[in-house]
């Protein structure tokens, strides 16, 4: 019996508008009906929560209104989008999956996605 595996891409480049998207996929050891997905940022051995959402299997996952994350779910796959990123937000973003219900609870953690964010160059003043 293998432990729950969570897969996510190794590297993602954010768009010029500071938006990064990646897929977090997990192999479930049980028949979970309630799943919690958390995005955590790891920097200098400090881990901080970026956003979290709980969803019922078959339903959409919803983040809090003030969250910088949005996402959609399909089976054991979650498509995550993080918005409002700046160059200083470049770092390792870890997908954590918890099978919350029914018991038993299971924990799965991805290896992390290195998100690179490059601030756009300011537009030069036009001289017409």
């Amino acid at each position: 019996c293998k432990a729950m595996h969570v897969a996510q891409p190794a590297v993602v480049l954010a768009s010029s508008r500071g938006i990064a998207s990646f897929v977090c996929e997990y192999a479930s050891p049980g028949k979970a009906t309630e799943v919690r997905v958390t995005v955590l940022r790891q920097a200098d051995s400090q881990v901080t929560e970026v956003c979290a959402a709980t969803y019922m299997m078959g339903n959409e996952l919803t983040f809090l209104d003030d969250s910088i994350c949005t996402g959609t779910s399909s089976g054991n796959q979650v498509n995550l989008t993080i918005q409002g990123l700046r160059a200083m937000d470049t770092g390792l973003y870890i997908c954590k999956v918890e099978l919350m219900y029914p018991p038993p609870y299971y924990l799965g953690i991805g290896n992390g996605t290195q998100i690179y964010v490059i601030d756009p160059e300011p537009c030069p003043d036009s001289d017409f």
């Epitope: 729950m4 955590l40 919350m100 609870y105 299971y106 924990l107």
Partner: antibody, heavy 119, light 107 residues
């Protein structure tokens, strides 16, 4: 810094009830799973229960299922353990512990509170 | 439920000795394995988390290894303050079981 302080322990007769509290400070309480772990005199550590984040999901050890209820008040940063139908074998030091935000290890523990069930 | 076993249950060692404690899970727990040290009358103290990561402030003579079902805690050179009981614990699935403990005392 993270601080966990338990209270509510004492001597109680078999079949009676007791409620333990754990006051937390120094971190965003609602972002963490909170646990109770106990240790009977001269014995090893036994995980008792966990309550997750918003309090909607709880899991228990078989030895306390149906008798103990874990709860939390995120507005007060406080964790509780309601213990009903107490038995002699529930005699132990009860610790509250914070599960790590990433892998769930117990990096922070309370000092423990003793519950003695005796007639 | 995942059962955790530890060996030995107790050991006698001298200051400066290299000490190895093993922990085995009844099924794969990936790297969700933690090690704690406990002294009489005190709360447990985290030493190693995620099988091999050293907790901040813990001396480097402590190290952990393993994944899946087999794990090891090593104390490279036992110090007087290391005489205590050591527990492994899995944080992969409920119930979050502990091993029965290994008591390290003075030879």
């Amino acid at each position: 810094q993270v601080q966990l302080v338990e209270s509510g322990g004492g001597v109680v007769q078999p079949g009676r009830s007791l409620r333990l509290s754990c006051a937390a400070s120094g971190f965003t309480f609602s972002s963490y799973g909170m646990h109770w772990v106990r240790q009977a005199p001269g014995k090893g550590l036994e995980w008792v229960a966990v309550i997750w984040y918003d309090g909607n999901n709880k899991h228990y050890a078989d030895s306390v299922k149906g008798r103990f209820t874990i709860s939390r008040d995120n507005s007060k940063n406080t964790l509780y353990l309601q213990m009903n139908s107490l038995r002699a074998e529930d005699t132990a030091v009860y610790y509250c512990a914070r599960g790590d935000i990433l892998t769930g290890y117990y990096g922070s523990w309370g000092q423990g509170t003793l519950v003695a069930v005796s007639s | 439920d995942i059962q955790m076993t530890q060996s030995p249950s107790s050991l006698s060692a001298s200051v400066g000795d290299r000490v190895t404690i093993t922990c085995r899970a009844s099924q794969s727990i990936s790297s969700y394995l933690n090690w704690y040290q406990q002294k009489p009358g005190k709360a447990p103290k985290l030493l190693i988390y995620a099988a091999s990561s050293l907790q901040s402030g813990v001396p480097s003579r402590f190290s952990g290894s393993g994944s899946g079902t087999d794990f090891t805690l090593t104390i490279s050179s036992l110090q007087p303050e290391d005489f205590a009981t050591y527990y492994c614990q899995q944080s992969y699935s409920t119930p979050f079981t502990f091993g029965p403990g290994t008591k390290v005392d003075i030879k």
